[in-house]
Interface confidence: low
């Protein structure tokens, strides 16, 4: 009867350097003897060499020389008594493309090279990007931990080395960024930033990386109100807005944020719970009244916090003259004469190019002024 | 400085052997994986051979295979490739290339001329 | 083996001329690819790598772009000293390959 050596092993296998991959393998060999139970041995060689002499690739016989190049990245899996002979090839080295076969070893009578079942190894180079895992959200302000994996490497061969870089990173403190987890406190000015998490073998030529762009929450910390595309000067959370009355006005609120916060314009200065004349963040009013003068609050409400302005509109209005009109009366002529602006204006009356003011005496000459707004009386 | 320098190249007869030398200095040797790369007379460039820095893995060009041998002395700073069974066709310039980043071959050697002709 | 194909052989230009140079790759090489300069008589010299990445030294009128399959190697201003030979290699699969070059000469 044929002796039956039979290997089950896939005949190619595909990894890209620096990566790791299992080589799923299980083998059957003639073995009858009941009255003794030498120990037995397999063995990975590289194709083309000769079983007696070179060194192999992985074994499990502690006298076997195993060579440098794969000691500790080539290893056997499994119970190689229940017929396991599954490798494990850990940091995928360019070198390692090639053949390989399997050999049995079992007392005097089982020695055997399964040279018809060969691996085929083929080591590509390394397109596989590592991951960044954000374990909570970023907020400005707040700590968080990120953390940066090659998905497919293993424990062996040399250690991995990281790198980080990004604007959101602090330059002053280098070896925080030399590691494979990294403690990130964002600024508002960080969102959108790329954040680049850079891999390396050591001892190896070719690094991996991955970028990301953060995306930052943050609270607004700045309002500002465009006039026909023209900011607003801002003094202490108030903005002043001198305006024409009956002038049509278009005012838009602008309160940078991640994610955008919900913009809204209330009259005057609103109470928290106030109803909005405006659900966004532009206010029109199709004609402006002297009645608005008190003004309008732009309010940005966001998860992380609110901030508001103040709009102080001065409403103001060219002057219309009633006047003047004078008429003889017991004490002798009286003329009277009305403005009607706001401010309210002042009125002087002219003799012979003299001014009279206010309230005043000059001669025979007298004069009543009031100003109640937006009239302004003179007679 | 970075340098590497051939030599050994020269007038062989077909079937004949010769082998050549490459001296690196300026870097730590061992670090680096090392190639033998040809130009045959007006032609392009073409990879014929590469070994990794311990010199435990080898490899070769499909038409070099089994006649040319490439080995590294790492305590002498030295690569070698011995060219047996020469062909007409083996005849060019032999550059030893250094392995830069991205597998590229950042440094190279001046290049030894090496004619195959009866 | 992975086959590399330059274009064009052979192009004629004059100093100042901005010149472009291809490559394409039988199968997809991510970014595995390098450029080289070779003037008669002398070694390559490496100019690019990694598709996108100027070698330290080299100038930055040389720019390398593409990803995949595709590769351009870019001259923004043409001077007297890059008249030479032009080859990418793919260094993405063993064995290494190269292209057939591009030999720029003067108009």
């Known amino acids: 009867e044929k002796p039956v050596y039979e290997l089950q092993v896939q005949k190619s296998v595909t990894v890209q350097e620096g990566l790791c991959v299992l080589v799923p393998c299980s083998f059957s060999y003639p073995w009858r003897s009941w009255y003794s139970s030498p120990p037995l041995y397999v063995y990975w060689f590289r194709d083309g060499e000769i079983p007696y002499y070179a060194e192999v690739v992985a074994t499990n016989n502690p006298d076997r020389r195993v060579k440098p190049e794969t000691q500790g990245r080539f290893r056997l899996l499994g119970d190689v008594q229940k017929k396991n002979c599954s490798l494990s090839i850990g940091d995928a080295r360019m070198e390692d493309t090639g053949s390989y076969f399997f050999r049995v070893e079992r007392g005097r009578d089982v020695k055997y090279s399964y040279q018809q079942n060969k691996l085929n190894l083929e080591v590509t180079a390394l397109i596989e990007k590592p991951d960044i895992h954000f374990l909570e959200p970023l907020e400005s302000g707040r700590p968080t931990r990120l953390s940066c994996s090659l998905p497919g490497s293993c424990e062996a061969g040399p250690p991995l080395t990281f790198s980080w870089t990004g604007n959101a990173l602090s330059p002053l403190d280098p070896e925080t960024t030399r590691s494979s987890e990294l403690t990130l406190t964002p600024r508002p000015e960080d969102h959108g930033t790329n954040l680049t998490c850079q891999m390396k073998r050591q001892g190896a030529q070719v690094t991996t990386e991955r970028t990301v762009q953060l995306n930052v929450s943050y609270a607004p910390q700045t309002i500002t109100i465009f006039r026909n595309g023209i900011a607003l000067e801002i003094l202490q959370n108030t903005s002043y807005l001198p305006v024409l009355e009956g002038q049509a006005l278009r005012l838009l609120c602008d309160a940078p944020s991640n994610p955008p916060a919900h913009l809204s314009w209330f009259q005057g200065s609103p109470a928290l719970n106030a109803t909005p004349i405006s659900n966004t963040g532009i206010l029109e009013l199709r004609r402006v009244r002297s009645a608005e003068k008190g003004g309008f609050t732009c309010r940005a409400q966001h998860p992380l916090g609110f901030l508001q302005i103040f709009l102080n509109l001065s409403v103001y209005s060219l002057p219309q003259l009633l006047g003047p009109s004078c008429s003889w009366e017991a004490e002798g002529l009286h003329c009277r004469c009305s403005f009607r602006a706001w401010p309210a204006p002042s009125l002087c009356w002219r003799l012979e190019e003299k001014p009279l003011e206010g309230n005043s005496s000059q001669g025979s000459f007298k004069v009543n002024s009031s100003s109640p707004g937006p009239w302004a009386n003179s007679s | 400085e970075v340098q590497l320098l051939e030599s050994g190249g020269g007038l062989v007869q077909p079937g004949g052997s010769l082998r050549l030398s490459c001296a690196a200095s300026?870097?730590?040797?061992?670090?680096?994986?090392l190639s033998w790369v040809r130009q045959a007379p007006g032609k392009g460039l073409e990879w014929v051979s590469g070994?990794?820095?311990?010199?435990?893995?080898?490899f070769y060009a499909d038409s070099v295979k089994g006649r040319f041998t490439i080995s590294r002395d790492n305590s002498k700073n030295t690569l070698y490739l011995q060219m047996n069974s020469l062909r007409a066709e083996d005849t060019a310039v032999y550059y030893c290339a250094r392995r830069g980043g991205w597998y590229s071959f950042d440094i190279w050697g001046q290049g030894t001329l090496v004619t195959v002709s009866s | 083996d992975i086959q590399m194909t330059q274009s064009p052989s052979t192009l004629s230009a004059y100093v100042g001329d901005r010149v472009t140079i291809t490559c394409r790759a039988s199968q997809i090489i991510s970014t595995y690819l390098n450029w080289y300069q070779q003037k008669p008589g002398k070694a390559p010299k490496l100019l690019i790598y990694?598709?996108?990445s100027l070698q330290s030294g080299v100038p930055s009128r040389f720019s390398g772009s593409g990803s995949g399959t595709d590769f351009t190697l870019t001259i923004s201003s043409l001077q007297p000293e890059d008249f030479a030979t032009y080859y990418c290699?793919?260094?993405?699969?063993?064995?290494?390959?190269f292209g057939g070059g591009t030999k720029v000469e003067i108009k």
């Open positions: 300026g870097f730590t040797f061992n670090y680096y994986a």
């Open positions: 290699q793919q260094s993405f699969s063993a064995p290494d390959t």
């Open positions: 070994i990794s820095g311990s010199g435990g893995t080898t």
């Open positions: 990694s598709a996108s």
